[in-house]
């Protein structure tokens, strides 16, 4: 059998195989050692007994989408049946005091591979044996502690495979420079040691995407905005836009990145090299936000120019080459033939990313201030608690609710939270009455809210002992 017979249904065309060559990967036309690595079809009854105590689930994830030319990393994590885990030696053991359907196990091991490898014979002086090989016959790499690695992972995509020895989780990175744009399929088959052979325990597949567009996300934050995920924001308060470029392999680390913003409110284009920008909308309504990100990224070099006729040099040719290749020298003397390509040149290509959002701007509570605090006189004898009125002003829209959070002087340990609807006139002046149990210093967070906004103010308040002569003080 060949690898492609074992690993996948998807057969890429000859063109795809030729043009999607992955560095360090092998062609799936290679032979598969079915004696050491038996192949079971889906639904084969043997899968049921491939693992003691249930089925192992493999979870395959990737940091897709990947900008073409960058590295994409795949991670496989094995999830064992309940109460099972991998120990420091790579053996599979039962978790202590964990009860599964079979109850508590007397034997601490599910698989004691250390014992198997110690019993193993047929080793030569290098510790290599005929069974410590991958499905294509290549020997296992002898990293320190390789004997504790008891799972064999075979990755398969684009007509090629990659084999890896590992523990219950492995990672593989692939450079995408030669990968066709668009969605691709990665399939992984996992085997476990079984004496001097291997048993399949899991298969998993996942789609990954290679793109020539920079993957761009924008987070938006605005003070007093009640719900940052609904793309509704408040008039007259700055919104902070933060651009996140999905570049987990740091492919663009040395690129100059430009951000071109259009906020949709006739304020024109704003170009910046900073990934954050603030913008304030001064009108209510719906606006179309557009962002274009441009980065000069390492990319394919242009095809060599046809040999020019021996006439006057062509300045545009030099310019063309320079636009791709910062290392290309200008013409030397008057001989255009000296523009020949330099080996191992670093060519650059402009990559773009786009983000578009429709944002709604509405009125909101812009500011809230406590302008006065009054101790409410209570009938004698003085009770344990104090009543305090906070006179509060606000700017912007009319609040509909008030919340007070009373906490310790560090403002960290909440003692009491009270929210209630409020009726406020157009002047936005209201009095909030709250009870304080006993004297001392309190942190008071007071928020005024409406449908779209939540404005906060804080103060430290010193509540005196219940002596009519003691004044109420703002601690700050």
């Amino acid at each position: 059998k060949r690898f492609h017979d074992v690993l996948g249904n998807e057969r890429p065309s000859a063109y795809m195989r030729e043009h999607n060559q992955l560095n360090g990967w092998s062609s799936d036309e290679n032979d598969w050692n079915e004696k050491l690595y038996p192949v079971w079809k889906r639904g084969d009854m043997r899968w049921k007994n491939s693992w003691k105590g249930g089925r192992v689930q493999a979870v395959l994830t990737s940091d897709s989408p990947a900008l073409v030319g960058s590295n994409i990393t795949f991670a496989v994590n094995l999830i064992f049946p309940r109460c099972q885990k991998e120990d420091a030696n790579g053996n599979i053991v039962y978790e202590k005091n964990c009860r599964n359907e079979a109850g508590l196990s007397a034997d601490p091991y599910v698989y004691n591979w250390t014992a198997w490898s110690e019993d193993s014979d047929g080793e030569n002086g290098t510790g290599q044996s005929h069974h410590n090989v991958f499905p294509d016959g290549k020997p296992f790499p002898h990293h320190p502690g390789w004997r504790r690695w008891n799972f064999i992972y075979v990755f398969h995509t684009l007509g090629q495979y990659f084999q890896k020895l590992g523990r219950c989780s492995v990672r593989v990175s692939v450079n995408t420079a030669n990968v066709t744009l668009g969605p691709q399929l990665m399939e992984v088959t996992v085997y476990r040691r079984h004496g001097r052979a291997y048993v399949p325990i899991a298969q998993v597949k996942d789609v990954y995407v290679v793109t020539d567009q920079i993957p761009v996300f924008v987070t938006m934050f605005q003070k007093n905005d009640r719900n940052s995920s609904d793309e509704t924001f408040l008039k007259d308060l700055p919104i902070m836009f933060d651009v996140l470029i999905h570049d987990p392999s740091h492919f663009l680390n040395y690129s100059t990145i430009n951000y071109k913003w259009s906020f949709g409110d006739n304020t024109g284009l704003f170009v910046s090299t900073n990934h954050t920008v603030n913008h304030t909308y001064v009108l209510n309504g719906t606006f179309s936000l557009n962002l274009t990100v441009k980065a000069a990224a390492p990319g394919p070099c242009p095809p060599p120019p046809p040999p020019p006729r021996p006439s006057k040099p062509t300045p545009s040719l030099a310019t063309t080459l320079k636009s791709y290749d910062s290392n290309t020298p200008g013409p030397a003397g008057d001989n255009p033939l000296e523009l020949s390509r330099i080996p191992d040149e670093n060519c650059q290509i402009n990559r773009y990313g786009h983000f578009q959002a429709t944002i709604t701007i509405v009125e909101g509570i812009l500011e809230v201030n406590i302008i006065q605090m009054t101790d409410v006189l209570m009938p004698v004898p003085w009770p344990e608690s104090s009543l305090i009125d906070f006179v509060v002003t606000c700017q912007g829209s009319i609040p509909t609710e008030v919340c007070t959070i009373i906490s310790d002087p560090t403002c960290e340990i909440t003692q009491n939270t009270v929210c209630s609807p409020v009726d406020v006139d157009e002047m936005c002046l209201l009095t909030v009455r709250r009870t304080f149990n006993g004297s001392g210093t309190y942190c008071v967070n007071l928020t005024l809210g409406d449908d779209t906004s939540l404005a906060l103010t804080s103060t430290l308040i010193s509540v005196p002992d219940r002596d009519p002569a003691s004044p109420l003080r703002m601690a700050n």
Epitope: T400, P421, D423, D425, T431, R433, D451
Partner: antibody, heavy 116, light 110 residues
Framework: EVQLLESGGGLVQPGGSLRLSCAAS????????MSWVRQAPGKGLEWVSS????????YYADSVKGRFTISRDNSKNTLYLQMNSLRAEDTAVYYC?????????WGQGTLVTVSS | QSVLTQPPSASGTPGQRVTISCSGS????????VSWYQQLPGTAPKLLIY???LRPSGVPDRFSGSKSGTSASLAISGLRSEDEADYYC??????????VFGGDTKLTVL
Amino acid sequence: EVQLLESGGGLVQPGGSLRLSCAASGFTFSNYAMSWVRQAPGKGLEWVSSISHSGGSKYYADSVKGRFTISRDNSKNTLYLQMNSLRAEDTAVYYCARKWSTFDYWGQGTLVTVSS
Amino acid sequence: QSVLTQPPSASGTPGQRVTISCSGSSSNIGNNYVSWYQQLPGTAPKLLIYDTPLRPSGVPDRFSGSKSGTSASLAISGLRSEDEADYYCGAWDSSLNAYVFGGDTKLTVL
């Protein structure tokens, strides 16, 4: 002068529906939260529901949650209470009131009778 | 069973001072304003006291409100026959997220 005028009450069978309206005048309706309060015959006052000035926040008594819906049309200065799945215990005079942290103005009420 | 507790009845002779109590908890009276409502027979309720102890315009100063901890009270001095009515206390309850009333207190002027 602030005026609140309820309408839409009447006799309805259990399980039936009714929509009450409250026409407001004498104040800037869109600046105020509004509420419905009811009073069963010979009984005390029971708050039913409240709505913020813009209509974005709504509160309901547990006894009517999921059956009644409060709404408002600020362009018409009108408050509504849509009552579905009515029960005999919903029989009451329904008052429309201004504000929601206190009720400073009340309408004269409209009688809703739920009976077969 | 009302969340706020009021006596079912109160009485007094003309000119006398009468007090009606209203008892609740920290989630209503303790941390929110208390209002008092008067309902004359056959009419809609009317706001007497709000944001303890404020009075809307048109309400005589014979009516006053006070609050101590989780209890509130309405005092009527110089009692008159036209004060004979049902009286209700009310407050927002922050735990229930609901406005709560006391059971009515029937005031009789003897």
